[in-house]
Every structure is written in C-alpha cells, then in structure tokens.
Interface confidence: low
C-alpha cells in the first residue's frame, strides 16, 4: 500500500520500510495531521519561551529566526515530547556558547503510540524537517550546510530521514543513542547512516540487546564518528536503587524517566554537558572498550582525539572514514565531563606492601587523589595508571603523593616517589621529582624536576 500527502509526497509499506526481518508488519505512517509535527524556536533573544514557527515566509520573518546563524533542530524520541525540559536545556547551553536558531521538534502526536507505529511515524517527522530545511533554502537562500539536526532515539532516525530527503546536503546530524528495535541491521535507506549528512556523529549509551536486556539503543556503528562512552552499554550512575533513582536531583519526573531508561537518556545528558565543556569528552580511538580500560589507548594519536558531543565537528579527521569508533569514560552525574591523565610513579625508600595515590595541582585546578598502584612497593620500581579526573587541572605545577600500608608495620617504614611523570591526553608530559621519603598517610609534595 501507499499513501500520499500534498507537501510531503508518498509513503509506502513496501520493503525495506516493512516486510523485512527487522520489521515484519506492513504498517504505514500516520498522516502529517495526526503526527502533528511542530517547530518550537528558541533563540538567544528568547531563551526561555519558544516561538512556534512553520515553513512559511511570514512565520519565519515574524520570529526571532536569523538567517546569519546556524540552525540546530532537536528531535525527541519514543513517548517523548518537544516541550520536555531536556530539549530546551540543550538550547540554553547552546546560547552560552553561540548565537543560534535552536528548533525543538515536537511530534508527540506520533510518538505516544505503540513502538512499531512510532517507528513508522518518524518518516513523517523526517519529511517535515526536510520540507522545513528546503523551505529555508528556497525562501531565504539559507544553506542546508548551516543546519545541524540532533535526534534522540527514534528522533535520530527521523534526522536520518530528513537528511536522506535533502540528499545529504545537511551539514551535520548527531544521533543520540539511535533506537535499536526496527532499525539495527536494516538497510541504510531506513535508518540513520553516514550518507544522510555531510557529517554524522553518534553517541551510544544503551547498546545492550533489546532482548533480554531492554537496551533501547543501537550497538551498530551508523555514523562517521561513533562514540561509546563507558563502553556504550551500562552508564555509571544508572544502577542506583529505585528510590534514589526516582527522587532524582532533577526532580521526580526526570527521576522516573531515568528509572525507566537511564542508559538511553544519558546520551542527551552527555551532549548537553559537552556544550559547556569543549575538551571534557575526548574520545580515544581503540579496538574495544576492554582494550581502553586496560590502558592501551592513551594518549591521543598525532591527529588528536575527537570530542564526543557538540564539538565533534572540530575533529580534523571527522569524515576520513565511516564507522570510526571512540571510547571514553564519563562521570556518574552531571557534570559528566572527565579529563584523562596517565601517571607514572617511580618509588624510593623501603620495600613494603601497600597502595599509592597521587593528586594533581595545576593552573586551572586541583584533582582528587587517584590510586596508581596496589601491591608490593619496591624502591626503583615504576608503576603507571590512567584515571579520569572530574577537574581539568591545566598545566601541571606540582603533584602530591601519599601511600598507605596494607598491614600494621611497627618499623614505621618510609616510602617516597623519586619521580612522577604526568601525561595529558594530548601527549604533553610534566616531570616532578623529590628526594624525600615519608611515613604512611603523610603527603609528599613533588615539584618540577
């Protein structure tokens, strides 16, 4: 069957839209009237209250839309709505760093139904966004390359559809945990893929299989750059008990949403934080997350590391290839940004059993204490570890070393760090030295060698 609409054209339930393994039911999308796609414009001039706009000359010109700014569309996913706080929060963070037309796309008329139907309704949403982009081009000479479409869950595939319909001329699409069911393993025509925009970046946060783990997001790479924070499956802070999950810092409603789909929602929270942390989400190219956590992917290669989220488009190699995979760790609550350091400690003093910790002090801030090694502490041995600091300390000025004994030792042995090397993710090294040794639980300050 096929159904046609005046502005948006025709929609078929033929393969691959329906009747394939991943979507066996023959279902058509609802009508544009029923999906009721709405465009809610926030700008630097109206950051708190949206202006509802349409693909119409008088509507756009009567609004705060500015043709000399970039336009970022944000498309929500299944069961969600365009007036939900998270979309406006993305806009508000954007206004802190740029002048922009920020358009939240509401399609709750089509998202609040069964999942299979909603997964078809995104075709209408994508067509509406494409129509809007084409209208801006024809009416205002506005280049699609100045358009960025950000889509969460089903919204990521709606963004892909918009990109496909505009022949890949849209500047950028960001997929925030693109939905897995009815999309993973399907032909590119159906789902988000790298041909949908000049640049496609993706954040995967809920990549466990839908059966039996209820992972709503895709594990499949679908962009030029695909980021797998914390491995892309289980996000830190999402394994809280039910009560603390629901009574969330952001309120009962956000807590309830988190309880239902915490990993899946993390993607847009990471993106929101990334806007105001331009270097706090460095993604490391690596064979797998296991290899990354084994400390084998540090520092960034000579071409640098891309930043997950808002600043991914600054990466020089962003479109060198498709399916480039990157790994990183984040925090367990906002602010989710982290700065990774490698610390190598050369020991001095007595041989004891214990563990050593180091804290970093720089021109931008100071870190907590991070454990570098646990076991037998031998003089002249060197131990290395990588950790993710919740503070960007900047250029290192000094480090502090402390050690703890694992057993009671009446001889009160002294241990020191003759040299500590700190390496940042861009490969910058700072060397610190001290001739001193200290008893356990006493801080030792090391200064530049």
């Amino acid at each position: 069957k096929e159904v046609c609409y005046e502005r948006l054209g025709c929609f078929s339930d033929d393969s691959p839209w329906s009747g394939i393994t991943e979507r066996p039911l023959h279902i058509l999308p609802w009508s544009p009237k029923d999906v009721n796609t709405r465009f809610l414009l926030y700008t630097n001039e109206n950051p708190n209250n949206f202006q509802e706009v349409a693909a119409d000359s008088s509507s756009i010109s009567g609004s705060n839309f500015k043709t000399n700014r970039k336009t970022r569309f944000i498309i929500h996913g299944f069961i969600d709505k365009g007036e939900e706080n998270w979309l406006a929060n993305v806009c508000k963070n954007l206004f802190k760093v740029e002048s922009v037309n920020c358009i939240c796309v509401d399609w709750k008329g089509g998202s609040r139904t069964g999942y299979t139907q909603a997964s078809q309704n995104i075709r209408i949403v994508g067509a509406e966004v494409a129509y809007f982009v084409e209208f801006l081009q024809s009416a205002f000479g506005y280049s699609p390359s100045n358009v960025h479409v950000i889509g969460h869950s089903l919204g990521a595939h709606a963004a892909g559809e918009a990109g496909r319909r505009t022949n890949g001329t849209i500047g950028r699409i960001t997929g925030l945990d693109p939905a897995e069911p009815c999309f993973q393993g399907t032909p590119e025509l159906v789902r988000l893929d790298p041909s949908d925009a000049k640049f496609v970046d993706v954040i995967h946060t809920d990549g466990a299989p839908i059966v039996p783990n209820l992972g709503f997001g895709m594990s499949q790479v679908v962009g030029h750059l695909d980021f797998f924070p914390n491995g892309g499956v289980e996000m830190p802070g999402c394994k809280k008990n039910i009560l603390s999950q629901i009574v969330d810092i952001d309120g009962i409603w956000e807590g309830t949403r988190d309880f239902a789909a915490c990993n899946h929602l993390r993607s847009y929270k990471y993106y929101t934080d990334s806007i105001v942390n331009p270097d706090g989400f460095a993604g490391f190219p690596c064979a797998s997350y296991n290899v990354f956590t084994a400390n084998k992917c540090f520092p960034c290669p000579s071409g640098g590391c891309p930043q997950m989220g808002h600043y991914a488009d600054r990466y020089p190699g962003k479109t060198n290839d498709v399916g480039q995979k990157f790994y990183l760790d984040t925090g367990d609550a906002s602010n989710f940004a982290r700065w990774r350091y490698k610390v190598s400690v050369t020991l001095s003093g007595k041989k004891v059993t214990g563990h050593i910790l180091v804290s970093l002090f720089g021109n931008k801030g100071n870190s907590k204490q991070y454990e570098i090694f646990k076991g037998t502490l031998k003089p002249d041995s060197t131990h290395s570890n990588e950790f993710d600091s919740d503070v960007d300390v900047g250029d290192l000025q000094m480090v502090k070393f402390i050690w703890y004994n694992n057993v009671i030792n009446p001889t009160l042995p002294r241990v020191g760090a003759s040299k500590i090397i700190v390496e940042t993710n861009v490969g910058k090294q700072f060397n610190f030295c001290s001739p001193e040794t200290v008893r356990e639980e006493v801080l030792l300050t090391l200064t530049p060698c």
């Epitope: 000359s57 000399n68 205002f140």
Partner: nanobody, 122 residues
C-alpha cells in the same frame, strides 16, 4: 502595491557576461532577503544566489566563483553579475524579495518579478 522589475537579460555568447538588475517599488517598510532564482525549460525553479539586508550572501554551489550578487539597500535593488556564462545557464531569471509592506508590522511576504530571459549561445 509592491512590484519587482527585472532587467538586463538578453542573448550572449558562451564566455560572455551579463548584469541583471532588480528594483522593488511601491509601499515598502523594509526588505529582508533579496535573491535570484532561475528556471530552465522543463526544470524546476532553483536558487541562484541570495543576499540579506546585512550583506550575507548565499550561492548555489555550482555557481560559486562565476556569479556575484550585490545589493543597494537605499535603492531597494539587487544585482547579479554573471561572468563566464555557459549554455547551461540559459533560463528565465526571477528576482525574489521578502518584503514587509508599509503598515504591515512585522509580517514579511515573498514577492516575485516576472522574469528576464537569459540565453547563452555556444
């Protein structure tokens, strides 16, 4: 009543140049974007170039470097300098402007000229 009047079209040999002009007249409060579109026989109307009141320009990718759009806000006019013309540039060229008529607060309406024909012979 607002009107757009194009001029400057005609027959030119490949490699030659033409300058199109378009002036808006009538009861005008302000003009937002002005631009040029073209329609070749049997094809859809397509954007050639546009310019905002602040001077920001936008060109069809295929025409960058050969065509230059400019604007005189005081005269409510827009110009298109076309160099190194090719036979595939043959089309009717239309002026387009987004105009707020006098007494119309902030509503903007899209106005079109009647078109001027450009023929490039090989």
């Amino acid at each position: 009543q607002v009107q757009l009047q194009e001029s400057g079209g005609g027959l030119v040999q490949a490699g030659g140049s033409l300058r199109l002009s378009c002036a808006a007249s009538g009861s005008i409060s302000s003009i937002n974007v002005m631009g040029w579109f073209r329609q070749a026989p049997g094809k859809q109307r397509e954007l050639v170039a546009s310019i905002t009141s602040g001077g920001s320009t936008n060109y069809a990718d295929s025409l960058k470097g050969r065509f230059t759009i400019s604007r005189d806000n005081a005269k409510n006019a827009v110009y298109l300098q076309m160099n190194n013309l090719k036979p595939e540039d043959t089309a009717v060229y239309y002026c387009n402007a987004h105009i707020t008529p006098a007494g119309s607060s902030n509503y903007v309406y899209g106005y079109w000229g009647h078109g001027t024909k450009v023929t490039v012979s090989s």
